[in-house]
């Protein structure tokens, strides 16, 4: 089981939208996949995917979760607030047929206040 997460760094304006993507791959098929998003080590949500569907569509405050076959798990934060800033990690585990787990690298989300004078010019960078 492999998990790749992106972007590494994401800067957005307060009130806008942030999208974090987790790519989950396994050479063989799986029947049920447990997924988890954490922010600064705290669990935001821990649904599972089976029959092509997520057991839960919400993930933390203003967070929406979606699954796009074959491998993309997306966490969309909308609207973004200042307290969304932090380090996000995606984790996945195949529960059926046999246990295998993996996690992505950290996505650091920076939320700028909705104030042009405080805007900093950071670049969103994705893994190569």
């Amino acid at each position: 089981l492999s998990v790749q997460q992106g972007p590494n760094l994401l800067q957005v304006r307060q009130g806008s939208q942030a999208t974090l993507v987790c790519q989950v791959d396994q050479a063989t098929a799986w029947e049920r996949l447990r997924v988890k998003w954490t922010k600064d080590g705290a669990i935001l949500c821990q649904p599972y995917i089976t029959n092509g569907s997520l057991s839960l569509g919400v993930c933390g405050p203003q967070g929406r979760l979606s699954w796009q076959a074959p491998s993309h798990l997306t966490l969309q934060l909308d609207p973004v607030s200042l307290n969304h800033s932090g380090a996000y990690v995606c984790w996945a585990a195949v529960e059926i047929p046999e246990l295998e787990e993996a996690e992505g690298n950290i996505t650091r989300l920076f939320v700028d206040p909705d104030d042009p004078t405080q805007n900093r010019n950071r670049i969103a960078s994705f893994p190569g």
Epitope: L1, D25, Q26, T28, A29, W30, N51, A69, P70, P97
Partner: antibody, heavy 120, light 113 residues
Framework: QVQLQESGPGLVKPSQTLSLTCTVS??????????WNWIRQFPGKKLEWMGY???????SYNPSLKSRVTISRDTSKNQFSLKLSSVTAADTAVYYC????????????WGQGTLVTVSS | DIVMTQTPLSLPVTPGEPASISCRSS????????????LDWYLQKPGQSPQLLIY???YRASGVPDRFSGSGSGTDFTLKISRVEAEDVGVYYC?????????FGQGTRLEIK
């Protein structure tokens, strides 16, 4: 360019242990998300997957080989190995090593194969 | 174990003519989670190791001529060669990676008439 090369004795006596090594070049076997496989081809051309060792060190074996098979690795040499115990003439085959990735699941690169004959 | 059954086992073809190989699995190789079929096709040319032709039932591997195509879903799959060339001679295998143990078809030997 990824290359896999099998090595080991071409002749093994019945009841002994068959030992083969696959040396990988152009790619690290510790790279995440990869399975390092052994596959054999019998004289009649039938292919049989024997097992793999994953990046994490986890192994999976073909139940048809029962407890006769062991796959291990030496990351310092970028090699992985096959041991098959209590061999009989029925284990005579061409033995291949091959890689497989989580992204895809197919056997992308194969060694050239090595013929192992079990005979006294 | 998933049993893979290929037909025919031998296939004599005239150059320039089409060829078709069937592969049937004892259980479905389609995943509703990933929307993929876990079925690949390989060609083993004389004296060589097998080489990937088609992955996930219908996707041509890099460098494979477009005269090769794969189709099917679930338990029934087909490999087609639109116009056979002399270099296509060898043994063709289907293989499932839906689950372990990974299993292959018996192979179909394509020969030139």
């Amino acid at each position: 360019q990824v290359q896999l090369q099998e090595s080991g004795p071409g002749l093994v006596k019945p009841s002994q242990t068959l030992s083969l090594t696959c040396t990988v070049s152009g790619f690290s076997i510790t790279t995440g998300g990869y399975y390092w496989n052994w596959i054999r081809q019998f004289p009649g051309k039938k292919l049989e997957w024997m097992g793999y060792i994953y990046t994490s060190g986890r192994t999976s074996y073909n139940p048809s080989l029962k407890s006769r098979v062991t796959i291990s690795r030496d990351t310092s040499k970028n090699q992985f190995s096959l041991k098959l115990s209590s061999v009989t003439a029925a284990d005579t085959a061409v033995y291949y090593c091959a890689d497989m990735a989580d992204k895809g699941g197919w056997f992308a690169y194969w060694g050239q194969g090595t013929l192992v004959t079990v005979s006294s | 174990d998933i049993v893979m059954t290929q037909t025919p086992l031998s296939l004599p073809v005239t150059p320039g003519e089409p060829a078709s190989i069937s592969c049937r699995s004892s259980q479905s190789l389609f995943s509703s989670n990933t929307k993929r079929n876990y079925l690949d096709w390989y060609l083993q040319k004389p004296g060589q190791s097998p080489q990937l032709l088609i992955y996930h039932a219908s996707y041509r591997a890099s460098g494979v001529p477009d005269r090769f195509s794969g189709s099917g879903s679930g338990t029934d799959f087909t490999l087609k060669i639109s116009r056979v060339e002399a270099e296509d001679v060898g043994v063709y295998y289907c293989q499932q990676h839906y689950e372990t143990p990974l299993t292959f078809g018996q192979g179909t030997r394509l020969e030139i008439k």
